[in-house]
Interface confidence: low
């Protein structure tokens, strides 16, 4: 079950006490505090693109910005997997890739990003207002999901930009650089807090979470910081879900796949408490912590399909061959 952690409410300083500089020095610690709190928080980005050549063909790209190891990626449409969404593809770093129509090709782009091409013909083809979601199960961060759809006025060939474009390839240097800045910020924050020790700190609203209840963090995005701050997706768009989606179809791919059924119709799903925030105008992106592993090495709850893939020494990037030509 998801519960929402509250964003710290910044209380303005009492007027006349410190003036402009005082206001700035008091706000800065809380900006830094926010950064410190979210410093270790992984993010998921989603990019949805309609191909200019095939108007009903989509490319979905998703990436995970976290330090943990990815154990499973699930791509769904019509909403998050387990909340009305239908699985399009499942990618496992060791056991391979499984996909269903209208997915045409799912593949790993990097160790932490994937892409999925959807074909646009037939009854089960996507349309412009379809919501696509990517869920990354990782250890130790847990399960994180993001959703995206084309902006309302997308021209063919254009795409909703990926959420954190500047850090799409978060290599070690980048991670260390960001970590260094954040570390410095946190130290500076502590210094500032000590200086303001005589003034009572603004109270953080308590989070309705417990160790057993995974949290969903909601951070309001600004134009300047959209790379790091995301808004949980509010409405699940199913208006374009074709009727045929209730039965999914394995569809093309590496020769080492096996059948991949799920328990979507049987497994109990906890109620999802989604933040009621509208979709950002520049494309819909979400970063929602969907829960932590109950035990190391166990599949996180509600990651969707039970993965039944055939291990292959070539790894998940071997995309040649039709399904099942073993």
């Amino acid at each position: 079950m998801r519960t929402e952690a509250q964003v710290p409410a910044l209380q303005p300083p009492e007027p006349g006490l410190e003036g402009a500089m005082g206001h700035r020095t008091l706000v800065l610690p809380w900006v830094l505090l926010t950064l410190c709190v979210t410093a270790g928080t992984p993010e998921v980005w989603v990019q949805v693109r309609m191909e200019a050549t095939e108007l009903s063909s989509f490319t979905i790209r998703c990436g995970f910005l976290g330090s943990g190891s990815i154990s499973l990626v699930t791509v769904s449409w019509g909403g998050p997997n387990g909340a009305g969404g239908t699985t399009l593809a499942v990618l496992h770093p060791e056991r391979g890739i499984r996909q269903w129509a209208p997915a045409r090709q799912a593949r790993w782009e990097t160790q932490s990003s994937i892409s999925l091409i959807l074909e646009g013909s037939g009854a089960s083809s996507p349309c412009a207002n379809t919501t696509f979601c990517c869920k990354f199960a990782s250890f130790p961060e847990g399960s994180w999901e993001a959703c995206g759809s084309l902006p309302p006025s997308s021209d063919p060939g254009l795409s909703a930009p990926p959420t954190p474009a500047p850090i799409l390839r978060a290599d070690l240097a980048g991670i260390l650089g960001v970590s260094g800045v954040l570390l410095f910020g946190c130290v500076y924050l502590l210094h500032l807090l000590r200086r303001h020790k005589h003034r009572p700190a603004p109270r953080l609203q308590p989070s309705r979470t417990s160790p057993q209840a995974p949290r969903a963090r909601a951070w309001a995005p600004s134009q300047a910081s959209q790379a790091a701050l995301h808004v949980p997706y509010a409405t699940i768009n199913t208006s374009c879900r074709p009727a045929t989606l209730d039965t999914a179809h394995p569809h093309g791919g590496p020769s080492w796949w096996a059948s991949l059924p799920t328990h979507a119709a049987h497994r109990p799903q906890g109620p999802a408490a989604w933040a009621s925030t509208p979709i950002p105008a520049r494309g819909s992106f979400v970063s929602v912590e969907n829960g932590l592993y109950a035990q190391a090495g166990e599949r996180p709850p509600h990651t969707g399909p039970g993965l039944t893939l055939f291990p292959d020494p070539r790894g998940p990037r071997a995309m040649e061959g039709p399904l099942g030509v073993r």
Epitope: T87, T247, H249, P261, H263, A264, G306, L307, T308, F310
Partner: antibody
Framework: EVQLQQSGPELVKPGASVRITCKAS????????IHWVKQSHGKSLEWIGY????????GYNQKFKSQATLTVDTSSTTAYMEIRSLTSEDSAVYYC?????????????WGQGTSVTVSS | DIQMTQSPASLSVSVGETVNITCRVS??????LAWYQQKQGKSPQLLVY???NLPDGVPSRFSGSGSGTQYSLKINTLQSEDFGTYYC?????????FGGGTKLEIK
């Protein structure tokens, strides 16, 4: 009512081939994988492979891959398994069973079985 | 290939007793396991899927449990129609191997 009706018993000579049919009815044929399972007399079950009628995709147990071929005819909602180069080791009852894709992860309906006897 | 070790191989019990059959798997299959019952000369029938889910029509005296590499099938208050052979099968990577079976006989 869901039914998987298999073809009758076969008596074949060593080295020959046999084709077993599995006629599905009572459900949407293309929504389910068809699996094939071997059971030698008094022995456990051995999974041979599956085929997905929607697109003909298939998966095999490596042990049977070179000998068994799985096909489907969606127009007649029938699945086929051909076994080549038969030996006495292939004498067994062969079952077809269905598995709902992305749902059950189990074989929820089985055919009645087809007995194949390989003898000269 | 994933190995499925079922135990015991055979079991002689009386009606009304409770039975536990276990299936040990050579690697973590993340609850992708089914149990079947097969009576002499008949096709197998699904009892449990996803390690612990009962399909419609299966009596509630049957229950499945387990995770990781250890799974079990429990039959409470055994009935005369429950006698037969029980098999586990995994669905985690082909080949979807079966256990060796557990033959349940009337004492």
């Amino acid at each position: 009512e869901v039914q998987l009706q298999q073809s009758g018993p076969e008596l074949v000579k060593p080295g020959a081939s046999v084709r077993i049919t599995c006629k599905a009815s009572g459900y949407t044929f293309t929504d389910y994988n068809i699996h094939w399972v071997k059971q030698s007399h008094g022995k456990s079950l051995e999974w041979i492979g599956y085929i997905y009628p929607y697109n003909g995709g298939s998966g095999y147990n490596q042990k049977f891959k070179s000998q068994a071929t799985l096909t489907v005819d969606t127009s007649s909602t029938t699945a086929y398994m051909e076994i080549r180069s038969l030996t006495s080791e292939d004498s067994a009852v062969y079952y077809c069973a269905r598995e709902e894709v992305r749902r059950d992860e189990a074989l929820d309906f089985w055919g009645q079985g087809t007995s194949v006897t390989v003898s000269s | 290939d994933i190995q499925m070790t079922q135990s015991p191989a055979s079991l002689s019990v009386s009606v009304g007793e409770t039975v536990n059959i276990t299936c040990r798997v050579s690697e973590n299959i993340y609850s992708n396991l089914a149990w079947y019952q097969q009576k002499q000369g008949k096709s197998p029938q699904l009892l449990v899927y996803g390690a612990s889910n009962l399909p419609d029509g299966v009596p509630s005296r049957f229950s499945g449990s387990g995770s990781g590499t250890q799974y079990s099938l429990k039959i409470n208050t055994l009935q005369s129609e429950d006698f037969g052979t029980y098999y586990c099968q995994h669905f985690w990577g082909t080949p979807y191997t079966f256990g060796g079976g557990t033959k349940l006989e009337i004492k």
